[in-house]
């Protein structure tokens, strides 16, 4: 039968006959020897199951006395096999045994469910010598024993490369309910099923379960532990915990919060990182997601100048980087801008508009209708054009440049000039004859210099030639731009 | 084709209210500014504000606010001007306009009298 | 606000001939001018947007010309079916602004 001993017993008398009855006695051991070492020991939850002590290994001495007579049988004697405590209490508990003197530097080691412990614990060794046996008691002694310490304990000792091992010292170790699983935060569904899992462990077994909901017990009835409870569905945020109870008493665990998922705010701060002609780089901070993650966001961008359509344009993105480069805009427009971004449950409303301008850029199209002819008379040549359309300008006209080449017996030189943006017609002087003459006109903002239209040759005769009909740009679909009259 | 449709005429009481409709098709309602004008007998065009009905958001001329708010309703692609605490300086064709003034709905007439 | 001073308040041409009306703005405006026509019980009729853009369906002798602060209309070859109120109205700024308008007739 095992015997138990509770925390409130008496220590049982470890040696009849000529030994002590007790550790309490004033009997003085002649030596005392902790055990010494320098590590701490790595406790564990014994697999062993209370109640079921294995006997300890029995080594037979094969050395006999000078009477040629057979030693007995070396075995630790039997002690307390069980041992309840509550959590934090102290615990001491022993082994003996009985070593004929024949045998020198015997020590006894700790293990707990198959693993020594080594180190810092309380682990005495004491020696008590007579004529022929020497008595040693092994004494373990826990102060405030945690749950950690719950396992199996033997003694082994050494003998003739025999090893001598005790029945084991079950300690078991009471208290309050320990979770294990507790329930988590979680973010759910509106109106959507879901589940929670609480699970506590003693000893002492039973751990029964309650659940409680914004400090209200849902369940009358205690549940076994584990329990999962299922939640019908919440309309909004809730609170919920555990109680695990048994004999000891009662664990609360924490609190978690159940959020209930819902459409973003918007987000805010939409500013303007960058603006160019034809796009406008903007960043956002997002708003509050609504307990889901962000999917992706919107640009809704709408023309916002006065005479403007007001056409708005929609451009999706990825959630992050909360950044957007905005394409495809008109030049020296003004754009209000917002964004909204939406999860799982739908989309946030549209952050602050904010206004935003498109710089000026380089024009798009050359001047149209280049016209080009000599002005004999005053050594000049004339040029015609017409400007762009304002659409296309992508700015304010500043003028326009001029590029004339002048190609003459393998000598060719190139000339700009740049002319105001009042008109639309220039002159300029004759810079070879016997030559021809190449002019491409670009329109200039701001932003910059436009494409040079198409080139319009003309040629200019030696003098005393007369009556020159002008070139010009070639009508679409004409392959030559080359009209030399 | 894009129309704008708007009730022929209003005859309200002084201090009273009215709630002018101006509805729109063959267009994508929410894509483009509603204008609205004001137009004594006689005399010359008065701009009241804008609406974008992709955000409901309005722009007010100084001069109207207070007088005029501005609405749209989605779902039937109309746009509304409510005038309040009317007097006989309100008596006038409002016109509703779209996008860059390129097409006008026909006017309503208002005419405040007791 | 922009104010914009319209003239003349009347112009009285005979056939053939052509009219010319003239905004001024108070602020600058770059080219965004449009202009109207309005006949008798009708609403407004856009006939040049901004940048000086005519109108598709527009007649040719129809044209516009300016930037920053002046702005012209040019009716050729006057027509009896041009008589009516002529229109401008700024579009640089909020809030937008008619000019006072010219009446258009023949003499």
């Known amino acids: 039968a095992i015997t138990e001993a509770r925390e409130e017993a008496k220590p049982y008398p470890l040696f009849p006959g000529p030994f002590p009855g007790s550790l309490q006695t004033d009997h003085t051991p002649l030596l005392s020897l902790p055990h010494a070492s320098g590590y701490q020991p790595a406790l564990m939850f014994s697999p062993t199951q209370p109640g079921r002590p294995h006997t300890g290994n029995v080594a037979i001495p094969q050395v006999t006395s000078v009477e040629s007579k057979p030693l007995p049988p070396l075995a630790f004697k039997h002690t307390v096999g069980h041992i309840i405590l509550s959590e934090h209490k102290g615990v001491k508990f022993n082994c003996s045994i009985s070593v004929p003197n024949i045998y020198q530097d015997t020590t006894i080691s700790w293990w707990k469910d198959g693993k020594e412990l080594l180190g810092a614990h309380h682990a005495i060794t004491q020696f008590y010598p007579d004529d022929e046996v020497t008595a040693i008691i092994a004494s373990f002694s826990i102060t405030s024993v945690q749950r950690s310490d719950n396992g199996s304990y033997i003694c082994k000792m050494k003998i003739n490369n025999e090893e001598i091992v005790s029945d084991p010292i079950y300690i078991e170790v009471q208290g309050l309910p320990h979770f294990t699983k507790q329930p988590e935060s979680m973010n759910v569904t509106r109106n959507t099923a879901f589940n929670l899992t609480c699970q506590a462990v003693g000893p002492p077994e039973p751990v029964n379960i309650f659940w409680v909901q914004n400090s209200s017990r849902v369940n009358e009835q205690p549940e076994k532990s584990p329990s999962v409870l299922t939640v019908p569905g919440l309309t909004e945020m809730a609170v919920f915990s555990c109680e695990a109870h048994n004999d000891k008493g009662l664990t609360v665990s924490k609190g978690v919060q159940i959020n209930i998922k819902a459409i973003p705010s918007p987000p805010t701060e939409v500013s303007i990182r960058n603006s160019t002609a034809h796009s406008i780089l903007i960043s956002w901070v997002p708003g509050f997601d609504g307990y889901s993650p962000f999917r992706n966001c919107s640009i809704q961008v709408k023309e916002a100048d006065p005479l403007s359509n007001g056409s708005v344009m929609i451009f999706n993105t990825s959630a992050l980087p909360h950044l957007y480069q905005i394409k495809q805009l008109q030049a020296l427009a003004n754009y209000s801008i917002g964004v909204s971004c939406m999860n799982e449950i739908g989309w946030s409303a549209v952050s602050p508009w904010i206004l935003a301008s498109t710089t000026e850029g380089a024009p798009s199209v050359a001047p149209l209708n280049v016209t080009v002819f000599l002005n004999e008379s005053s050594d000049n040549v004339d040029i015609r054009w017409m400007k762009p359309p304002t659409k296309q300008q992508d700015g304010e006209l500043v003028g326009y440049r001029i590029s004339h080449v002048w190609q003459s017996a393998g000598i060719s030189k190139e000339l700009l000039e740049e002319v105001g943006q009042n008109g639309s017609r220039a002159r300029i002087s004759v810079q070879v004859h016997n030559a021809t003459c190449t002019v491409r006109i670009a329109a200039v903002t701001r932003g910059g210099v436009g494409p040079f239209s198409d080139p319009v040759k003309i040629f200019i005769p030696a003098h005393g030639w007369v009556d020159y009909a002008p070139s010009s740009t070639p009508a679409p679909g004409n392959a030559d731009p080359v009209l030399i009259i | 084709q894009v129309q704008l449709q708007q009730p022929g005429a209003e005859l309200v009481k002084p201090g009273a209210s009215v709630k002018v409709s101006c509805k729109a098709s063959?267009?994508?309602?929410?894509?483009?500014?509603i204008h609205w004008v004001k137009q004594r007998p006689g005399q010359g065009l008065e701009w009241i504000g804008r609406i974008h009905p992709f955000d409901s958001e309005p722009n007010y001329n100084q001069k109207f606010k207070g007088k005029a708010t501005l609405t749209v309703d989605k779902s039937s692609s109309t746009a509304y001007m409510h005038l309040t605490s009317l007097t006989s300086e309100d008596s006038a064709v409002y016109y509703c306009a779209l996008a860059s003034f390129a097409y006008w709905g026909q006017g309503t007439l208002v005419t405040v009298s007791a | 606000e922009t104010t914009v001073t319209q003239s003349p308040a009347s112009l009285s041409m005979a056939m053939g001939e052509k009219a010319t009306i003239r905004c001024i703005t108070s602020t600058d405006i770059d080219d965004k001018m449009n202009w109207y026509q309005q006949k008798p019980g009708k609403p407004p009729k856009l006939l040049i947007s901004a940048g000086n853009t005519l109108r598709p369906g527009v007649p040719s002798r129809f044209s516009s010309s300016g930037y920053g602060t002046d702005f012209v209309l040019t009716v050729e070859n006057m027509l009896s079916e041009d008589v009516a109120d002529y229109y401008c109205l700024q579009g640089g700024a909020l809030p937008l602004t008619f000019g006072s308008g010219t009446k258009l007739e023949i003499k």
């Open positions: 063959g267009y994508t309602f929410t894509n483009y500014w």
